[in-house]
């Protein structure tokens, strides 16, 4: 029987160089498959596949080609009818737009376009047009779309070609032609400056064309070796030193790159004659010295002789001999305000040149001027004076109380100063101040001035009050009418916070300091500022209160057998509270009560009447105990009223007043009776009252009054007093 044809042969994936085939196994039994496919050349290629195969990839195909595929099942010599399918490989992405974007004299820049991520690499060929010599090949990564091609010949036509490689397949070649530019040339060369032993050379050249310039300096008409130097390619000028005077030179310059050197440019020049000694000048003049400068070629003279003579004087000149290498000399020891003639000779092996001469007048001796007391304080003065710059070694200042013969206070100050503070003086005292300057041991005339120190302003009694967790008040005393401002500095003792400074009006004597952190130790510094005076700083310390976590321990409802303890605490701050009650004499065991963190009061009962107790309340948070709040209390029997006072007494009435006991009572009972005897009268008033009117009294009679406090069935001890009606 005939073999079944393989079923549903199809192409599931196409790529540029491969096709993926899928099929289903035929029903009838068979041994193997034979797969045949046609090449673009017309040839057929056959492949034998095992019977369990249901897919196969044809590889190594050409992009953009159609392929015929036949699949046959075989058993022994029997073959099924072939299953057929036709498919084309993908077109290879094309290279496009090969352009030469930049042309240099020794290189080109290529750009091209191509599909992204398509190429493994590109191969670029560069060949001189019209030449058959081997081309230059470059392989560049497939990610590039531009490349620089260096190392080409100047002014030369080139053919550039490129192809891409995809999975071993080469794309068609793109080509372009371009010519390199002309070799850059040096422009012109000029000698900008000529001296007797040096010259300056300038030249022009294109920017960035040369790595360096090679310069040769050769004496004309001699066989002496040339002087060679190289300078960086960025320079366009250089100095050529070390030349001979009055000599012809030929100078050549070349631009040099890695590959070539330009044609040299040349220039000829004649150096100047050697100058004579010249230009004797005085560059600095002071009252006792001057500085000479002169010019002369190096190596010309062995030494110089300088003569300094006062003009119009016949006394001997002052002579100095200095080495031939010097071109400058300081002449000290002159007289102030004096004309001098200075002459200079050069000497060569004992031969002296004709002298150069210069006349000069030394400065007048510097004077001190304008001694002034510019600021007056209560304990010091500020002196200012004027004087020539850099003239003085130091100044000597004398300060003496006007009406005292005791030794003056002397200060020696650097000569650079023109002002000084003189501290440590007595307040409200007249002083004479004098000053002189010292110049190399010479004293200037003395200048003097008189001034009185001011009355001493005072601040004191810095007090801190009304301390809260975030603020406190300050108060102080100060001399009236003197201070412009007060400066308050608040510094925390641990120096963890920034110093806060307040400047307030000099009229103020109090300040409210707020915005402070709680539980912090502060030092407060106060100083007063009056015109030109800041007082000594005074200080005080303050500690802001802690933010209340546990506070306000209160004892209420005191009675003979107990009392109520209450306190305040931050919401949800404590897990529990511990209330400890100890008798003041420490005779009894302490009583401890542990309460939940939500409770704020505890009623204590069963205590002993009339003894003192200490109550302590602590909070606990995660096992940590706060420092306790403490209070002391005495249990007592019903408290008696106190201080009976009578007022508003008439013939038949009077007002009686009293002070209520500490503990709350329900009522007061007032009993009054004439001292001579009779029936007692009684009035009961509410426990909140502290006075009542007694009426229907007999004129001119002395009454005895007693008052007791009552609560429930308890009565206090009475308190008594007496009065007489009018």
């Amino acid at each position: 029987s005939e073999l079944d044809t393989p079923k549903d042969l199809q192409v599931s994936e196409t790529a540029e160089t491969s096709l993926t085939l899928l099929w289903k196994t035929p029903l009838a039994k068979f041994d193997r498959y034979r797969l045949n496919y046609s090449l673009p050349t017309g040839q057929w290629v056959g492949v034998q596949l095992p019977r369990n195969t249901t897919s196969y990839v044809l590889r190594g195909l050409e992009p953009g080609q159609e392929y015929n595929v036949l699949l046959t099942a075989e058993k022994g010599r029997h073959k099924s009818k072939p299953a057929r399918v036709k498919a084309s490989t993908e077109q290879a992405p094309e290279l496009e737009n090969l352009t030469v974007t930049e042309v240099g004299w020794d290189g080109l820049r290529l750009n091209w376009t191509a599909a992204d991520q398509a190429y493994e690499h590109f191969i670029i060929q560069v060949q001189e047009a019209n030449k058959v010599e081997a081309a230059r090949n470059l392989t560049v990564p497939g990610s590039l779309r531009a490349v620089d091609i260096p190392g080409l010949k100047a002014a030369t036509p080139y053919t550039v070609s490129i192809y891409g490689v995809i999975q071993g397949y080469r794309t068609p070649v793109l080509s372009a032609e371009a010519s390199t530019g002309e070799t850059p040339n040096l422009g012109e060369v000029v000698v900008a400056e000529v001296g007797w032993d040096a010259l300056k050379l300038n030249w022009t050249a294109p920017e960035g064309a040369y790595e360096y310039f090679f310069i040769q300096v050769q004496e004309a008409d001699t066989v002496e070796a040339a002087q060679n130097l190289t300078v960086p390619g960025g320079l366009r000028s250089t100095d050529l030193p070390g030349l001979k005077a009055a000599t012809h030179y030929t100078i050549t310059i070349r631009g040099v790159t890695q590959d070539f050197s330009t044609t040299p440019l040349s220039v000829e020049v004649l150096t100047e004659e050697v100058p004579d000694m010249g230009n004797l000048t005085v560059t600095e003049v002071s009252w006792d010295a001057l500085r000479l400068n002169w010019t002369t070629p190096d190596g010309t003279y062995d030494q110089f002789t300088i003569q300094v003579q006062e003009a119009d004087q016949v006394e001997e000149a002052h002579n100095l001999t200095v080495p031939g290498s010097l071109r400058s000399m300081e002449i000290p020891g002159l007289r102030a305000g004096t004309p001098y003639t200075v002459t200079l000779h050069g000497e060569v092996r004992g031969h002296s040149t004709r002298p150069l001469a210069v006349e000069v007048v030394t400065e007048d001796l510097p004077q001190l001027g304008d001694l002034a007391v510019s600021e007056v304080g209560w304990d010091g003065l500020r002196l200012n004076w004027t004087a020539a710059d850099n003239a003085y070694e130091h100044f000597v200042i004398q300060v003496q109380e006007v009406n005292k013969v005791e030794a003056a206070q002397n200060l020696t100050l650097p000569g650079s100063l023109r002002a000084v503070d003189i501290p440590g003086l007595e307040a409200a005292t007249p002083y004479r101040v004098s000053i002189y300057g010292v110049i190399r041991g010479y004293r200037t005339p003395v200048l003097s001035a008189e001034a009185s120190t001011a009355k001493e302003p005072e601040i004191g009694n810095l007090n801190v009050s009304d301390i809260t967790p975030e603020s406190f008040n300050l108060s102080w005393m100060a001399t009236d009418g003197i201070f412009e401002t007060f400066t308050i500095e608040i510094i925390d003792s641990n120096r963890l916070l920034e110093t806060v400074e307040y400047n307030i009006s000099g009229a103020e004597r109090t300040a409210h300091i707020s915005g402070l952190p709680p539980s912090t130790d502060f030092i407060v510094y106060l100083s007063g500022l009056a015109p030109s005076i800041r007082t000594k700083t005074i200080s005080a310390t303050a500690t802001t209160e802690a933010l209340p976590l546990l506070e306000n321990l209160t004892i209420s409802d005191i009675n003979p057998y107990g009392f109520t303890v209450s306190w305040m605490a931050s919401e949800n701050a404590f897990d529990s509270f511990l209330v400890t009650v100890v008798d003041s004499g420490k005779l009894l065991d302490p009583q401890e009560f542990t309460l939940s963190g939500t409770q704020r009061k505890l009623e204590l009962r069963g205590l002993i009447t009339g003894i003192g107790y200490e109550v302590m309340v602590s909070g606990f948070t995660q096992g940590h105990q706060t420092k306790p709040l403490r209070a002391e209390i005495v249990t007592e029997a019903m408290g008696s009223p106190k201080e009976v006072i009578f007022s508003d007494i008439t013939e038949n009435s009077a007002t009686v007043s009293w002070r209520a006991p500490t503990a709350q009572v329900e009522s007061f009972r007032i009993t009054y009776v004439p001292i001579t005897g009779g029936t007692p009268s009684m009035v009961t008033v509410d426990g909140t009252k502290t006075q009542t009117r007694l009426v229907k009294l007999i004129p001119g009679v002395e009454y005895l009054v007693s008052i007791i406090a009552m609560k429930g069935f308890e009565e206090s001890e009475p308190v008594s007093g007496s009065f007489t009606t009018a």
Partner: antibody, heavy 118, light 107 residues
Framework: EVQLLESGGGLVQPGGSLRLSCAAS????????MSWVRQAPGKGLEWVSA????????YYADSVKGRFTISKDNSKNTLYLQMNSLRAEDTAVYYC???????????WGQGTLVTVSS | SSELTQDPAVSVALGQTVRVTCQGD??????ASWYQQKPGQAPVLVIY???NRPSGIPDRFSGSSSGNTASLTITGAQAEDEADYYC??????????FGGGTKLTVL
Amino acid sequence: EVQLLESGGGLVQPGGSLRLSCAASGFTFSSYAMSWVRQAPGKGLEWVSAISGSGGSTYYADSVKGRFTISKDNSKNTLYLQMNSLRAEDTAVYYCAKTSPRVPLDYWGQGTLVTVSS
Amino acid sequence: SSELTQDPAVSVALGQTVRVTCQGDSLRSYYASWYQQKPGQAPVLVIYGKNNRPSGIPDRFSGSSSGNTASLTITGAQAEDEADYYCNSINSTRNEVFGGGTKLTVL
């Protein structure tokens, strides 16, 4: 006798997670708050987290907030610390500790080492 | 930075008295607890509250507090007291805070 035994430490990569356990015995576990405290090699003690006896309230150090979760299973007498987004600076010995109403951190376990390294 | 500050190291001659201090704002409101830690061991509570010692802690250990400073005093230091000592308290957010620790050397 109160006993606390930590487990679950080990080597973990940065960004990884780990869960520490602390098995408690010798006291009524549900009545007591518990804490985790850690100690980096050669460094001091650093409190990490705490939980109330019932497990209803939790507290965390700023350095672990949002990354670590403390919990307790009172039926199993076990305290847990779930550590996520671990960093190299979390490398330490982790101790669990018991807290009594008036005595902070009165019993400690022997600790378990957590190493965060790539 | 730690909210509780301790001296890094303190030394004491054998049998002498030494005081280890701890400073911090939370100590204005709360007593400090003190822990002893020996190398390779877990910390041990030695002082808590105003001046309480857990059972088993010798009476040479005592605590005191003033202002924002807490102190642990060892009267007659022994060789076995050589250890690191940490103070501990609680801050306003109910979080535990530890001092940086003090290394005590017994000479």
